[in-house]
């Protein structure tokens, strides 16, 4: 905390501007009127301040505004957000897409920092909803983004805001998250044609069930193997030879190199021996011919 | 890759001025401020000032001030350092270098350019 | 405006010695302390910033340690190619200001 002193002479701010960067901290804490910063923090960005001389601007901020920095002040922060603790910016209230893209901008190149997940997080419960233009701007920040919310809150994203998503967005996702988000991406995307429909849903297929699978696969999708890997094991194991031959398409050969990994490994065990001889691929594991194949859950269900 | 190049030395008469440029390439003028360094020969290093090439607001060191003139071509990404009523002892290499421009905590010259020899003499 | 003092002002020494070289700020700078390598006819080179760490391409071998008004640049094993004038730089406050330097030659 800088002590208070009364400002020298002939060095009390009228404006602030380069000048203020020669200024000891004392004299900022003594000089600068709160009010004449909050107007002007706009400048504070394209002012070469110190880190010394930027702990007391806030310093002054913080007097200022007890309460929370008004959105206005907040908007123009700049490199001063950086000062900011989760505890400040939870007495913030911020509603404009604009103000969000500037304080990301700040923190551009660097991790997701608790400040900024306290901002978002801010943000997106004051609008109640994480529609497409946030969605498009947090993503194009933090690509993992998504990936970072719990199924809870994947829960109020609108399907309409699916559209904003890249494939690259989803890559840290795991099942319990694109179980939500897939049925939402299959009705933003329900209207689409065959080819372009796959284009779209591919990335989400994570969290697909078994009957959209069989639907998929009497398409000529041509699903490659690393969507195929990160299907659900239990979407997977219902499928027929026949089905994933077609799901896969000319990428059915890549089965051979994933055998031991799941679902492929798991799969093959639930298959006739015979129906997998019929790829051509080598596949071992299968249930030898003449067994008879029990679906117990099936029987449970039953009893 | 990230460079600074400066324009070439120049030979003044007591009293003139001198403009030296410096031109950036390889990473996003708007991002950093340019400071200008001199030194002396045979002596250590003297910090003159720091232009901001993003709003082009700057600031000069009191021993400079009235006599130096910092500016910048966004669209060229080159800024300017112009030193007036020029003495023999202004005789020095003068360097541009840049900082990035943030939270304070980064205003250590990080790449420079390869120095402009100002020679001042009648 | 921040005085910054380095000692020695030069020092003499072989390949493969420990050299230390020692930066005294008139008040405290925190840790904004910057050290630069310079060869003659060259612009000067980062080596460390923020008291310590160590900057993009530098060798390991370079190290710098301290806070508040006194800080140390070390060389753990001395280069053929290190033999150059160092120099710190505070950026705490404005005007910049640099140390006087330390001429490292050979022995």
């Known amino acids: 905390e800088v002590e208070k002193t009364a400002c020298p002479s002939g060095k009390k701010a009228r404006e602030i501007d380069e000048s203020l960067i020669f200024y000891k901290k004392w004299e900022l804490e003594a000089c600068v009127d709160a009010a004449l910063l909050a107007t002007q923090m706009d400048r504070v960005n394209a002012i070469p301040f110190t880190y010394e001389q930027l702990d007391v601007l806030k310093h002054k901020l913080d007097e200022l505004y007890p309460q929370g920095y008004p959105e206005s002040v907040i908007q123009h922060l700049g490199y001063l957000f950086l000062k900011m603790s989760p505890e400040d910016i939870r007495k913030w209230n911020v509603t404009s897409l604009e103000t969000l893209k500037a304080l990301l901008e700040v923190n551009k190149g660097h991790e997701m920092s608790p400040q900024v997940a306290t901002l978002i997080d801010r943000f997106v419960k004051g609008r109640g909803q994480l529609d497409k233009d946030t969605l498009d701007t947090l993503t194009a920040f933090y690509p993992g983004y998504l990936c970072s919310l719990s199924p809870e809150e994947l829960s109020s994203v609108p399907p309409s805001s699916i559209w904003a998503v890249r494939p690259q967005d989803l890559d840290t996702c795991d099942p319990r998250q694109l179980d939500v988000l897939y049925p939402k991406a299959r009705l933003a995307f329900q209207n689409m044609n065959g080819s372009e429909y796959f284009v779209k849903i591919q990335s989400f297929l994570g969290g697909a069930p078994t009957e959209d699978l069989k639907a998929l696969s009497q398409q000529n999708v041509s699903m490659d193997l690393a969507t195929f890997m990160k299907l659900r094991t239990d979407a997977v194991l219902p499928l027929t030879v026949a089905e994933v031959q077609k799901l896969l398409g000319p990428h059915v050969e890549g089965l051979k190199a994933e055998e031991r990994h799941r679902p492929v490994r798991d799969w093959i065990l639930r298959q006739r021996q015979d129906d997998l001889d019929t790829l051509g691929l080598g596949l071992q594991g299968g249930i030898p011919n003449g067994y008879l194949v029990l679906d117990l859950s099936m029987q449970e269900a039953l009893s | 890759q990230v460079q600074l190049v400066q324009s070439g030395a120049e030979v003044r008469a007591p009293g003139a001025s001198v403009k030296i440029s410096c031109k950036a390439s390889?990473?996003?003028?708007?991002?950093?401020?340019i400071h200008w360094v001199r030194q002396a020969p045979g002596q250590g290093l003297e910090w003159m000032g720091i232009i901001n090439p993003s709003g082009g607001s700057r600031a000069y060191a009191q021993k400079f001030q009235g006599r130096v003139t910092m500016t910048r071509d966004t669209s060229t990404s080159t800024v300017y350092m112009e030193l007036s009523s020029l003495r023999s002892d202004d005789t020095a290499m003068y360097y541009c270098?840049?900082?990035?421009?943030?939270?304070?905590?980064?205003?250590?010259?990080?790449?420079w350019g390869q120095g402009t020899l100002v020679t001042v003499s009648s | 405006d921040i005085q910054m003092t380095q000692s020695p002002p030069t020092l003499s020494a072989s390949v493969g010695d420990r050299v230390t070289i020692t930066c005294r700020a008139s008040e405290n700078v925190n840790i904004w302390l910057a050290w630069y390598q310079q060869k003659p006819g060259k612009a000067p080179k980062l080596l460390i910033y923020k008291s310590s760490s160590l900057a993009s391409g530098v060798p390991s071998r370079f190290s710098g340690s301290g806070s508040g008004a006194e800080f140390t640049l070390t060389i753990s094993s001395l280069q053929p190619d290190d033999f150059a004038t160092y120099y710190c730089?505070?950026?705490?406050?404005?005007?910049?200001?640099f140390g006087g330097g330390t001429k490292v030659e050979i022995k």
């Open positions: 390889g990473f996003t003028f708007r991002g950093y401020y």
């Open positions: 730089q505070q950026y705490q406050s404005y005007p910049l200001t």
């Open positions: 270098a840049r900082t990035a421009s943030c939270g304070g905590d980064c205003y250590y010259l990080d790449y």
